[in-house]
Each structure stands twice: as structure tokens, then as C-alpha cells.
Interface confidence: medium
């Protein structure tokens, strides 16, 4: 921003009013007035070039400092050429001085030399020759000086001639300030510029309404240089939540929208699902039966609770189920839906039920399931069993109600035991089986079938309260196919399936190779 | 100021489709959301669908199969597209801004008009 | 699908008259119920929204009022500037457009 200037004193304005002193009194300086654009102007002047040493002073009037540091001096003037004036005349100049004086009150026409300090000698850029003089046309020259730091009330100027030929059309004091300035959304007043030329006078902003320094942000500031330009801008204000920057200034958010935090981001739509907001809005209040999950944006839309899962299937093989079911119908507008499977059980005989996550298997975690299936295992026989799956998704904690979709299924066998070879000899198989820990207690005995290969005739049976038996008085180097099952109060359960082992040949040395 | 402006082609053969772009200024596509809303020859305003300015669309369920509206925001543009047109689908299209989340429209172009016809 | 209904399809005034027109939703809107004006040339215009919020540059001779299932639009000194068809429209669920009305002057 260009700087601001100050007018203390304006020679050339006053019209010949000011009234300045002049020393020796009535010798050197003179007023005179001239008719320029038919317009009166005042000059200050002395042509003193062929009198030999001269000393003339011109002092201003006192000039009130105020709140100014550094005044700088303009100065337009006319100086002639000494060639000009017959034999060059040897005392005359071509310059004259510049001098200052501070002090807290007016002397008056007390006038001491001593008091007065010089601040430079004036030379022109251009002299006025006697061809110009005599077709009047005056090089007008213009000089700036500054000064400073002032300190007392106020001050004098002083012009010293020493024997030129100079006239003074204009003499103006001024000082700069930066003006007064809207930048970041802050505001920094008219500030008095500094007197030192590498010295930045640091001035610290105020936010615009409805604007804040952000969190951990710099308060702004800006150096208000000599000139009187700003310099260096450091930190900003932003509009606050709910205000939006338009040109200089914060504006509220339009109904309609709204705007969460102090940032440099417009007010934004408030989103699907949301009521209508009013002005200044810092969030949209979602609709009834609409939600926000704690890290959902306030730029995303209110969300709800899934439905139900689709379509839900309870497949059941052996002691175990497949549970198979597709997503909702409603996402609720969310994609972060997981699925849970809770399991009941109840027994057919009493009527009795209760949960069985404890005494299932599940073929992995059943709590925030991404996929759309699970396999239970470790299913009682004889037993109904009822598989709720709920779908939920980031904000079904909000409500109480639950979205989930039940199938049931009743296992009337048990698993199918597992069955292995322990050891073999030329006439006997040793054979051993399990279940799952939670059937064993529903078996009665196990049943093992076994016959030879390709003899469909006949078969043999073994039944055991144990999980092995050694078959014996059997046929060397022949396949047998062996099954076991389990036999509980209310019948058969799954068969193994079958398997097929083979007795030693006599050759083969050992009694029980395995 | 807010402006909108429908560009068509004109006449359109019956089962052929339909493309309509909106230009849009004065305001800026990502921040404001626009629909299309269109109204044959002496009859009443049907609601056609509209994209919001995060980008999802919402259509008129009885159109939904045939419509679909996109949009370039760096060119601010909307594009309604609507296959197998028939005679009843000629009309004035129109685009409309929607006005914050009051669910209505305060801005709208000043419509092209679609003759369906061989 | 939410039905509107504009039971009066033309509506004939004088100039300075204080007219309303109705409009009927088929079932509780919430006051999500705006108002448009259709000059003949095709021009459309929003002049009221949520019931009765008046949109900026609107004359102050436009009000609405409403609730439920029920809303309507006064004009409280016809011009005739103002000849032009009016349409109700519902934001509850998507969007839908009463028939219109269509006002003349006498």
C-alpha cells in the first residue's frame, strides 16, 4: 500500500502568509510575488552574487512536530547560471544550505545560528542560463531531504545562502504513515512510518468480524516501513465456522449451507439427508431417523441403519451348517457394513433354549464379518438351532432397534467320525476315530463295518464304547474297506466314509508296521 | 450472477437418445448441486433427477433406467443423457441449481426445447 | 411417489386483486413445499421456498403459508406483471410438481 503523506508546513499554499524571517533583517532573502496562470505566487529570493561573502538566512516560521519521527523536506527552486552575470562574478555561487533546529517552544524572531544543524547542501540538477532567464524560462529544480528522529515539540528549517542567485517557490514538510489497510481478513490502523531507514516498525493486526487467528496459527502482523509502504505481512485471520470470505470481509454461510471450522474453505451444501439450516450454520442437523457416526465429515451425508440382510440360508451337513445370506436391500447409505451371527439352541425334548457360542465353531470371528457367509460346526445331534445374522453399519449404534434376519435348522446326526490307521499286521488292522467333544456325549457305542474288497456278499461288525479296535483274523495282503458310526438312543448317526486298508504280506517283516 | 444455460439438439428420432448439456456461471459446480426437470407441450413440471455437488445422483424412479446425468466441474458443465426416446418424451428441458439443502430450485436456465419425431 | 395436487388450473383476477392458490400434497411434506412462477415465454422463477421463505429479489407481495398437507401462495396486489402460470413443488421425498395454475386477468 503506497504510503500516506502528512503536510506540516506548505510554502507554496500559504500564499505568501507565513511570514518567515529573515537574518541579516532586510538584507539577502526577500518576499516577492509573481503572476503565474494568472495565478499570484509567492517566492522566496536572493541574488546577492556580486557583493562578495554573503551569509543570508531564511528561517522558517515554528513548525508543531505532532506525532511525526521523520519529516522529509521538498524543496523546488530556481538557481542561476553564474556565467550570467557580467565577469562571471568570482564570489557567486551556485548552492545554497539546509539546515534545522528543534526545540519546544518558539523563539520568535530570536534567531541564534548556533541552535541550527545542517542537513545538506542544496545543488540544483539544472541552472537557468541567461538565454533562458531572458526568455523566461526558469529550470525549476526539485530536491527532497529527510530528517530524523525528532524528538522535542517542534522545529525550524533554515536556508543559508552564500552568494547565489536562488529563488524558492516551494517548501513542504511532510511526514508518512502507512495508511490504514485491510489484508488477510485483518486490520491494521494508520500507522506513524519509522524514523530509522532499516528499521520496520512491527504492527500487529486485528481480525475482521467473525474472523479468528486459526488454531496454533501466527497473530497476523505487517511492518509499517519508513516510506510509509507495508512490508513483510506475517500470519492471517480466517472466517470463523459458519462465515465464509467474501472480498474483505466474513460473511455468514447462506441457509442452506454451512461451514464447520475457522478455514480458508467456502460455506459448503449441506449435505443428503439434512434439515434446512439457517444462516450461519456451523453443521446440518440431520433429519429424523438419519444419522452421523462420531467420525463421519460434516461435508458427508446423514446416514442410516441398514435393513435386514436379504436373503438368509441355514444348509446343514452333518454337524455342521452353512449359513449363507446376501446384503440389504438398504445400505443406509453407508459402505462400512459388517454382519454378526449369534447362535441359539434348543433342545426338542424340553423345549429348553439358550446360547451356543460356546459349544460351536465358527470358521472365522462371528462379530464384524465383511463376507456373506459362515460355517458353524460342532453342531449336537438332535438338537434345533435358530442363527440370527444382523447387519450393522456406522451409525446402527445410534438406534436401538436391530436389523437382522433368523434361520433354523435341526441336526438329526452327528458328525461323521474321522477315522485312521493306527498299526497293521499280516492279519489284523488297528483302527481308531474321534468326534467333535460336544457329540461324544450322545453316542451310545460306534458301530465299525468292514468286509473284503470286491466281496459284496458279506460283512463283518464290531461295535466298542471306545475309539479304537484292532480287527483280527484277517486275511494277509488283502484290502478291507472299513467304516465307523455312531449309534446314539435315537438312532444311527453319520457314517465315516469308507476307507480302505490293507493287512501285510507275509514277506513283509515286523508285527505292526504303521 | 448465476447463470445456466441449456444447449440440445433440437429434434431427436424416436428410440434414439438424447444428450443436453447445462453451462453453468456464477457459481461453482462442486458446491452447488443441479437438476433437470423437463415439461412437454401445454402440460405441467415433471422432476427428471439431478446430480449433487459431491457428485452422487438421485432420478425420478419411473425414468431411472433411461437417465443419466453427469458433470464436468473444471468446465462447469452438466450432462443429462436419456435413451430410446419416444414421441412423449419431446419437451422443454430445463436446469435448475438447487438452493442449499431446502430442496428446491432457485435458479434456472431458460430451457431447450426436444421434438422426438422421424 | 408423493402426489401434488393444484386443484384450480386457471384462476382469472383484476388488477390490485389479493388472490391465493392451493396446493395438496398426498401426505405430510414438512413444510418442504416451494412455489414457482412461469412467465409464456418459458421463464421460471423461484419465489417462495420452505413454505414461506420469500427468495431474494421476490416482491413483498408474494407470501406462503402452510402446513402438513396444505399449502398455498397469496398474491396481495395483482399486476400485471404478475400473469404467469404457478407451479407448488415438494422436496420431502425427490421432487414433485403440482399441475400448475394458470392466472389471467379479467
Known amino acids: 500500500a503506497q504510503g500516506k503523506e502528512v503536510v506540516l508546513l506548505d510554502f507554496a499554499a500559504a500564499g505568501g502568509e507565513l511570514g518567515w524571517l529573515t537574518h541579516p533583517y532586510g538584507k539577502g532573502w526577500d518576499l516577492m510575488q509573481n503572476i503565474m496562470n494568472d495565478m499570484p505566487i509567492y517566492m522566496y529570493s536572493v541574488c546577492n552574487v556580486m557583493s562578495g561573502d554573503q551569509d543570508n538566512w531564511l528561517r522558517t516560521n515554528w513548525v508543531y512536530r505532532g506525532e511525526a519521527e521523520r519529516i522529509f523536506i521538498e524543496l523546488k527552486f530556481t538557481v542561476r547560471d553564474c556565467n550570467s552575470f557580467p565577469g562571471g562574478a568570482s564570489s557567486c555561487k551556485e548552492t545554497f544550505n539546509l539546515y534545522y533546529a528543534e526545540s519546544d517552544l518558539d523563539y520568535g524572531t530570536n534567531f541564534q545560528k548556533r541552535l541550527f544543524t545542517k542537513i545538506d547542501t542544496i545543488a540544483p540538477d539544472e541552472i537557468t542560463v541567461s538565454s533562458d532567464f531572458e526568455a523566461r524560462h526558469v529550470k525549476l529544480n526539485v530536491e527532497e531531504r529527510s530528517v530524523g528522529p525528532l524528538t522535542r515539540k517542534g522545529f525550524y528549517l533554515a536556508f543559508q545562502d552564500i552568494g547565489a542567485c536562488v529563488a524558492l517557490l516551494s517548501v513542504r514538510v511532510y511526514y508518512k504513515k502507512c495508511p490504514e489497510l485491510l489484508q488477510g481478513l485483518a486490520h491494521f490502523p494508520e500507522t506513524i512510518a519509522g524514523s530509522d531507514a532499516p528499521s520496520l516498525a512491527t504492527v500487529a493486526g486485528t481480525c475482521v468480524d467473525h474472523a479468528v487467528v486459526p488454531p496454533g496459527g501466527e497473530e497476523p502482523r505487517m511492518h509499517c516501513a519508513v516510506d510509509g509502504e507495508w512490508l513483510v505481512p506475517i500470519g492471517q485471520c480466517l472466517c470463523q465456522a459458519g462465515y465464509e470470505k467474501v472480498e474483505d470481509a466474513c460473511q455468514a454461510c447462506s441457509p442452506g449451507f454451512f461451514k464447520f471450522e475457522a478455514s480458508e474453505s467456502p460455506c459448503l451444501e449441506c449435505p443428503e439427508h439434512t434439515l434446512p439450516s439457517p444462516e450461519g450454520a456451523t453443521s446440518c442437523e440431520c433429519e429424523e431417523g438419519f444419522f452421523r457416526a462420531p467420525q463421519d465429515p460434516a461435508s458427508m451425508p446423514c446416514t442410516r441403519p441398514p435393513s435386514a440382510p436379504h436373503y438368509l440360508t441355514a444348509v446343514g451337513m452333518g454337524a455342521k451348517v452353512e449359513l449363507r445370506w446376501t446384503p440389504p436391500q438398504d445400505s443406509g447409505g453407508r459402505e462400512d457394513i459388517v454382519y454378526s451371527v449369534t447362535c441359539e439352541q434348543c433342545w426338542p425334548e424340553s423345549g429348553e433354549c439358550g446360547p451356543c457360542e460356546a459349544s460351536v465353531r465358527y470358521s472365522e470371528p462371528p462379530h464384524g464379518l465383511t463376507r456373506t457367509s459362515v460355517t458353524v460346526s460342532d453342531l449336537e445331534p438332535h438338537m434345533n438351532y435358530t442363527f440370527t445374522v444382523e447387519a450393522r453399519n456406522g451409525v446402527s449404534g445410534l438406534v436401538t432397534s436391530r436389523s437382522f434376519r433368523t434361520a433354523s435348522v435341526s441336526i438329526n446326526q452327528t458328525e461323521p467320525p474321522k477315522v485312521r490307521l493306527e498299526g497293521r499286521s499280516t492279519t489284523s488292522l488297528s483302527v481308531s476315530w474321534s468326534i467333535p467333544p460336544p457329540q461324544q456325549s450322545r453316542v451310545w457305542k460306534y458301530e465299525v463295518t468292514y468286509r473284503k474288497k470286491g466281496d459284496s456278499n458279506s460283512y463283518n461288525v464290531r461295535r466298542t464304547e471306545g475309539f479304537s479296535v484292532t480287527l483280527d483274523d484277517l486275511a494277509p495282503d488283502t484290502t478291507y474297506l472299513v467304516q465307523v458310526q455312531a449309534l446314539t438312543q435315537e438312532g444311527q448317526g453319520a457314517g465315516s466314509k469308507v476307507h480302505e486298508f490293507q493287512t501285510l504280506s507275509p514277506e513283509g517283516s515286523g508285527n505292526l508296521a504303521v | 450472477q448465476v447463470q445456466l444455460k441449456e444447449s440440445g439438439p433440437g429434434l431427436v428420432a424416436p428410440s434414439q437418445s438424447l444428450s443436453i448439456t447445462c453451462t453453468v456461471s456464477g457459481f461453482s459446480l462442486s458446491r452447488y448441486s443441479v437438476h433437470w426437470v423437463r415439461q412437454p407441450p401445454g402440460k405441467g413440471l415433471e422432476w427428471l433427477g439431478m446430480i449433487w455437488g459431491g457428485g452422487s445422483t438421485d432420478y425420478n424412479s419411473a425414468l431411472k433406467s433411461r437417465l443419466s446425468i453427469s458433470k464436468d466441474n473444471s468446465k462447469s458443465q452438466v450432462f443429462l443423457k436419456m435413451n430410446s426416446l419416444q414421441t412423449d418424451d419431446t419437451a422443454m428441458y430445463y436446469c435448475?441449481?438447487?438452493?442449499?439443502?431446502?430442496?428446491?430450485?432457485?435458479?434456472w436456465g431458460q430451457g431447450t426445447s426436444v421434438t422426438v419425431s422421424s | 411417489d408423493i402426489q401434488m395436487t393444484q386443484t384450480t388450473s386457471s384462476l382469472s383476477a383484476s388488477l390490485g386483486d389479493r388472490i391465493t392458490i392451493s396446493c395438496r400434497a398426498s401426505q405430510d411434506i414438512s413444510n418442504y413445499l416451494n412455489w414457482y412462477q412461469q412467465k409464456p415465454d418459458g421463464t421460471v422463477k423461484l419465489l417462495i421456498y420452505?413454505?414461506?421463505r420469500l427468495h431474494s429479489g421476490v416482491p413483498s407481495r408474494f407470501s406462503g403459508s402452510g402446513s402438513g398437507t396444505d399449502y398455498s401462495l397469496t398474491i396481495s396486489n395483482l399486476e400485471q406483471e404478475d400473469i404467469a402460470t404457478y407451479f407448488c413443488?415438494?422436496?420431502?421425498?425427490?421432487?414433485?410438481f403440482g399441475g400448475g395454475t394458470k392466472l389471467e386477468i379479467k
Open positions: 413443488q415438494q422436496g420431502y421425498t425427490l421432487y414433485t
Open positions: 435448475a441449481r438447487k438452493h442449499g439443502n431446502y430442496y428446491t430450485m432457485d435458479y
Open positions: 420452505y413454505t414461506s
